[in-house]
């Protein structure tokens, strides 16, 4: 594979986060080559001596893949020719967190870039009116979070108000003994107001809004990954 080790190509990565138990993407792009057979992609992880993934001559080459990634990785083979070296990681584990290197060799030269990959659990909260409660109460539930998040309530009418005295948050460990279900209850809510339940850890921030009027209830949820451009 005759490349002069002196030429460098541009490789770009994006920090991202993976949701435990789901599939994740480690993003990497590079200056494309005209021949697929001239492109080599190697993914490495700090502290792991075997390869995370290797793609060469148009196909996966997994003979040197480290055990911890066996059967869990794939590149987007049809997109390699246009410079996409992103790695799909199946069934993300907590231990997949760390620094990865995307290393590319083409006929033009070689290049690499590192990316930080965080792992945890995050999910959309759903806010509902708790009709079983003795007073007007809102219940905010999110099924999977890790690490343990903070929960803060806010209201459109009482902006800047501190609801910690009139709310109660609990965390219930899920069956796989890693992630937790988040339940937060807000008491003494008033009608014709919009309340927000904000759940946040160092990986993600999620908000569940509920607008309660005499005639209707409107809900909206939003989730944003932190420290990530993905």
């Amino acid at each position: 594979f005759g490349i002069s080790g002196r030429h460098s190509i541009t490789v770009t990565t994006v920090a991202s986060a993976g949701n435990i138990g789901e599939d994740g993407i480690l993003s990497c792009t590079f200056e494309p080559d005209i021949k697929l057979s001239d492109i080599v992609i190697q993914w490495l992880k700090e502290g792991v001596l075997g390869l995370v993934h290797e793609f060469k001559e148009g196909k996966d080459e997994l003979s040197e893949q480290d055990e911890m990634f066996r059967g869990r990785t794939a590149v987007f083979a049809d997109q390699v020719i246009v410079g996409n070296a992103s790695l799909r990681l199946k069934n993300v584990q907590l231990t997949d967190a760390g620094t990865y290197k995307c290393y590319i060799i083409t006929s033009k030269g070689k290049g690499n870039a590192n990316l930080e990959y965080k792992t945890g659990a995050f999910s959309m909260p759903e806010v509902n009116v708790d009709y079983n409660a003795s007073s007007e109460t809102l219940r905010c539930e999110a099924p999977r979070w890790f690490p343990q998040p903070t929960v803060v309530w806010a209201s459109q009418v009482d902006q800047g108000a501190n609801f910690s005295e009139v709310s109660n948050t609990s965390f219930e460990l899920n069956s796989e003994n890693v992630t937790m279900k988040v339940v937060s209850v807000l008491y003494n809510v008033t009608i014709n107001n919009t309340y927000s339940c904000m759940i946040e850890n160092d990986i993600a921030k999620a908000t569940g809004d509920i607008k309660v009027t005499e005639s209707e209830i409107k809900r909206r949820s939003h989730l944003q990954l932190l420290n990530s451009k993905a």
Partner: antibody
């Protein structure tokens, strides 16, 4: 100063056991993968075993697999090689070495002075 | 396992000579190659990593080249302290392997 210091070598009978130690100092031990490399008298270098920085992954040459066990104690900054069922062909100077680079793709940049293992009846 | 074949196994040279040692891998190892120098009774010393890079403190008369399967260690002007045995080593595979060594002797 970055340093590796091996100990534990000696004379042992065939079938016997030895435990080699390698005390590390001057660097953050748990961020570097470590190797054991041996050199039989008058011969070249032979890789024996490796362990990842966390200790979670271990690797062995076919010639020692099932007989040798590599481990590390991060609290003591020490690397170990437990050698069982020793054979005459295990006679060598054993070196511990630190892996350069965060991703395992580079060479071994720091070596100990070596400890001699002699297997003979 | 990946076989690493060094040539020559020994050579005689004089101070000031340009010396070239080659190493061939049995399969593509890209640039996952290191070179070491070893003197009698001493531990090996890293000379080159990633096929072409010199660690801090290694004199610039040492250089490495190559990628894929064919690699070269060059000493541009041999010095008295360079008489030693030189080894190549691959780290592409997690069954690390060394070449058989090249002994550089005084002519």
């Amino acid at each position: 100063e970055v340093q590796l210091l091996e100990s534990g070598g000696g004379l042992v009978q065939p079938g016997g056991s030895l435990r080699l130690s390698c005390a590390a100092s001057g660097f953050t031990f748990n961020t570097h993968a470590m190797h054991w490399v041996r050199q039989a008298p008058g011969k070249g270098l032979e890789w024996v075993s490796a362990i990842s920085g966390s200790g979670g992954s271990t690797y062995y040459a076919d010639s020692v697999k099932g007989r040798f066990t590599i481990s590390r104690d991060i609290s003591k900054n020490t690397l170990y090689l437990q050698m069982n069922s020793l054979r005459a062909e295990d006679t060598a100077v054993y070196y511990c070495a630190r892996l350069l680079g965060r991703f395992g793709e580079y060479g071994m940049d720091v070596w100990g002075q070596g400890t001699t293992v002699t297997v003979s009846s | 396992d990946i076989q690493m074949t060094q040539s020559p196994s020994s050579l005689s040279a004089s101070v000031g000579d340009r010396v070239t040692i080659t190493c061939r891998a049995s399969q593509n190892i890209y640039t996952w190659l290191a070179w070491y120098q070893q003197k009698p009774g001493k531990a090996p010393k890293l000379l080159i990593y990633d096929a072409t890079n010199l660690p801090t403190g290694v004199p610039s008369r040492f250089s490495g080249s190559g990628s894929g399967t064919d690699f070269t260690l060059t000493i541009s002007s041999l010095q008295p302290e360079d008489f030693a045995t030189y080894y190549c080593q691959q780290s592409y595979s997690t069954r690390w392997t060394f070449g058989g060594g090249t002994k550089v002797e005084i002519k």
